[in-house]
Interface confidence: low
């Protein structure tokens, strides 16, 4: 279920899957929520530790049992991912942090009159992930009112420093507040060029697009269908970026599909989950559990309820069925995507709905009935 | 290092310069200080030069041009080349150097932590390669220690880029698809370090690559985690304590 409590002065020991710098525990929790394997996190505020390298450290953790031993650490904050928390799942983070400089690649500097204007500039720049603003009282006069737009390889700051009269924050693109707008078109038989930032396996271009939307550095993508000529590249979803923010070239290519991240859409973003079930498809991955259930929908529900489950395959092979129930294989991988996608199998596959924000399992929302 | 920038004092305090003094003296390879008396480097640095008395190891330095005849250096007590390394292949490109005298640690000269044995689960997102090597394919040794931030590439992706070589599980690759940033000649033996949980770890030893910083040709590094048993075995001192830095 959904666990929202935070543990003050506690640090989870072990289980690290990733680490990064974040300005506070809430942002760390959000990164944990969207990380494919993170179940728990621990955050070290600047006040909690003398080691400059570990200040603002956000440690994402996984555990086979869903829990880890807590050790006392003054000032540390720990908690759970919000993967099963329905309406609380959002990549939107509006906070502005005073007295903090979030470091990254500074790719644009301009003079603005307020931190809000700086955040708006970041939100309206295709490559900007976060920003820092030197206020009117910054100690070096030439830097005052400077708005620095930034990005980094992982989408989070490469370092965070305590610095007076500097204010920092994140792009509000995940809040659907970008003025850029987005391309909803999907381009059949077209491959985009430029830099690959990641490669995952997906069953279709729509899942590929959703993964691109929530990947910090993906601006557009190319998907190679299951009939692509090179067998090893079938179902490959290439997440891409470029200096300009758009593909520098595109090549007509049979059995490829390309499109853009929807992060810059106004008003609404796609849900960070994939609800479609794919008949005749087997998703390969690390086996989490195998259970007998009645029907593919129940298999998907079982996967959704088991927090570590990322995707599943429901087998209809006679040897995998007992009366009305068949084997439901609950699976996971390092990146949350299948490690292999096979076609022509007797069964169906799909994804956990743990990141769908329409769930009714939030402890912080009141469910209202429709009239 | 291609596409890199100047490092600053004490930024990479484990980086050492392996130099050969024959008729003239020149920098040949990098290396990483892993203990008071131990340096980890690439085996191929000793191809043709296995004589320990010709080598000079400079630690705690930033600028090679600052080296004079009075600059202190370490000498080699023992070169331990991995038993399975072959000159004709790229595999097991790892060597340990035991120094004649232990080094004191300072802000500018201290060891890098080693990864856990067989570390395959850690996802490293902040990795850097450093060295005084060429800044372009047909370049020359650089005076100031260079650094460059390079993402790790999966072995599967790396194998695709090097279809005529075997990329083994004991190698790790790093590079940008578009090229432009990479290690190069003279960086061999030096460190590929990644920051994880606020701690720098030695993930790779600069080994080889198709040219330098070419598109779709990542750099190939010896994966240190795969050689932890070997490192521990070789660095065990007589009192049974490992003379190197390993994360708690």
């Amino acid at each position: 279920g959904c666990l929202t409590q935070l543990y003050e002065n506690a640090f989870f020991r072990g289980g690290d899957v990733a680490s990064m710098y974040t300005p506070n525990a809430q942002y760390c929790q959000m990164r944990c929520t969207f990380h494919p394997r993170c179940l728990l996190f621990s955050f070290l505020p600047a006040s909690s530790i003398n080691d400059m390298e570990k200040r603002f450290g956000c440690f994402l953790k996984d555990s086979v049992t869903g829990t880890l031993p807590k050790v006392h650490r003054t000032g540390a904050v720990s908690g759970h991912s919000l993967k099963q928390c329905g309406h609380q799942i959002s990549a939107c983070h509006r906070d502005i942090y005073k007295g903090v400089d979030m470091r990254g690649v500074n790719f644009n500097v301009s003079k603005v009159s307020s931190v809000e204007e700086c955040q708006k500039r970041c939100t309206s720049n295709i490559r900007c992930q976060f920003f820092s603003y030197a206020t009117q009282t910054f100690h070096k006069a030439e830097y005052r009112n400077n708005c620095l737009l930034k990005y980094s390889p992982g989408g989070t700051p490469t370092a965070i420093k305590v610095l007076s009269n500097v204010e920092s924050g994140f792009s509000l693109k995940p809040c659907a507040l970008s003025e850029i707008g987005c391309h909803m078109n999907i381009f059949q038989h077209l491959a985009f060029s430029d830099v690959d930032v990641a490669r995952v396996l997906t069953p279709d271009a729509f899942v590929c697009r959703t993964i691109c939307t929530y990947h910090p550095n993906c601006l557009f993508f190319t998907f190679y269908t299951n009939v692509w000529k090179i067998e090893s590249q079938r179902n490959v979803c290439l997440l891409k970026t470029s200096e300009s923010g758009t593909p520098s070239s595109s090549t007509p290519q049979e059995n490829t599909i390309s499109g853009y991240s929807l992060l810059t859409c106004k008003r609404t973003l796609p849900e960070p989950c994939h609800s479609k079930i794919y008949p005749g498809v087997d998703f390969g991955g690390e086996e989490l559990n195998v259970t007998f259930v009645k029907g593919v929908n129940v298999c998907q529900e079982t996967c959704t309820k088991m927090i570590r489950c990322q995707f599943f395959t429901y087998s209809l092979l006679p040897e995998d069925c007992k009366e009305e129930k068949c084997k439901c294989f609950l699976r996971l991988s390092m990146d949350g995507s299948p490690t292999r996608i096979a076609y022509g199998t007797q069964g169906s596959s799909g994804y956990s709905l743990r990141l769908c924000n329409t769930g009714d399992n939030s402890v912080c929302t009141t469910k209202t009935s429709t009239r | 290092i291609v596409g890199g920038t100047n490092s600053s004092w004490g930024e990479w305090p484990w980086q050492v310069s392996l130099q050969v003094k024959l008729t003239a003296q020149r920098h040949l390879c990098g290396g990483s200080l892993i203990g008071h008396q131990w340096v980890l480097t690439a085996a191929h640095c000793f191809d043709g030069l296995p004589l320990q008395d010709v080598w000079r190891i400079y630690s705690g330095i930033l600028n090679l041009s600052d080296i004079t005849k009075d600059t202190p250096f370490s000498q080699i007590k023992e070169i331990i080349i991995h038993q399975n390394y072959k000159v004709s292949e790229g595999n097991h490109d790892i060597a340990l150097i035991k120094l004649q005298a232990p080094l004191n640690y300072t802000e500018f000269q201290k060891p890098i932590c080693l990864p856990s044995k067989g570390d395959t689960s850690t996802i490293y997102t902040n990795c850097w390669v450093t060295g005084w090597g060429f800044s372009k394919e047909k370049g020359e040794i650089q005076n100031i220690l260079q650094k460059v931030n390079i993402p790790l590439v999966t072995n599967e992706e790396c194998q695709k880029r090097y279809q005529d070589y075997k990329i083994t599980q004991r190698m790790v690759c790093a590079g940008y698809k578009e090229g432009g940033k990479d290690a190069c000649k003279g960086d061999s033996g030096g460190p590929l370090v990644c920051k994880h949980n606020g701690m720098w770890r030695l993930v790779g030893i600069t080994s080889w690559g198709e040219g330098c910083a070419r598109r779709e040709q990542p750099g190939v590094y010896t994966k240190v985690a795969e050689y932890m048993d070997w490192i521990l075995e070789k660095t065990q001192s007589s009192d049974g304590k490992a003379q190197m830095q390993s994360p708690a």
Epitope: - | H44, S88, K138, E210
Partner: antibody, heavy 122, light 106 residues
Framework: EVQLLESGGGLVQPGGSLRLSCAAS????????MMWVRQAPGKGLEWVSG????????VYADSVKGRFTISRDNSKNTLYLQMNSLRAEDTAVYYC???????????????WGQGTMVTVSS | DIQMTQSPSTLSASVGDRVTITCRAS??????LAWYQQKPGKAPNLLIY???TLESGVPSRFSGSGSGTEFTLTISSLQPDDFATYYC????????FGQGTKVEIK
Amino acid sequence: EVQLLESGGGLVQPGGSLRLSCAASGFTFSHYIMMWVRQAPGKGLEWVSGIYSSGGITVYADSVKGRFTISRDNSKNTLYLQMNSLRAEDTAVYYCAYRRTGVPRRDAFDIWGQGTMVTVSS
Amino acid sequence: DIQMTQSPSTLSASVGDRVTITCRASQSISSWLAWYQQKPGKAPNLLIYKASTLESGVPSRFSGSGSGTEFTLTISSLQPDDFATYYCQQYNTYWTFGQGTKVEIK
């Protein structure tokens, strides 16, 4: 500047011996595979022999196997070709060469010396 | 041993012509093929390696293609400086050169 300078060529009688040298400068000689390539007058290029960076591995074309020996002295930055039992068909310009970049131990040659002429005649 | 066969052995062409030289390997060499240009009395000069990668400093009118056993060197618009002998070389297993193609003025 990178340079390869061959020497030791000359006129020799069939059955005789000759030792060619190639002095290298401007690069880290000990890092590279070195090669000898020859070209008979008016003919094409023929690879003769190669030596890996440490000197521990040597390879030869079938036409010279057992007669020629390649060696190197990394401390002197010098490559050698000891040619014994010379025949008329060994008459050629002999070039030393190496490839200065690329994957270790496997590449084309892009740095050549200017060559030294060996004439085998009675 | 891998044999390399070049064709034609001589090629007569004029300035501005598009020139194509082919090279065939006796067995697959993947992309491990280089092309050299040689002028009389001079050492060869590397133009292309790995079948299609242009060596730095070589004019873009030179291009290479092919893999496996069939390879091609193309000069898109022949210049006066391009009249020379061209060699292919495999480096998949040791090193073998083709017999050369002389490009002469028509």
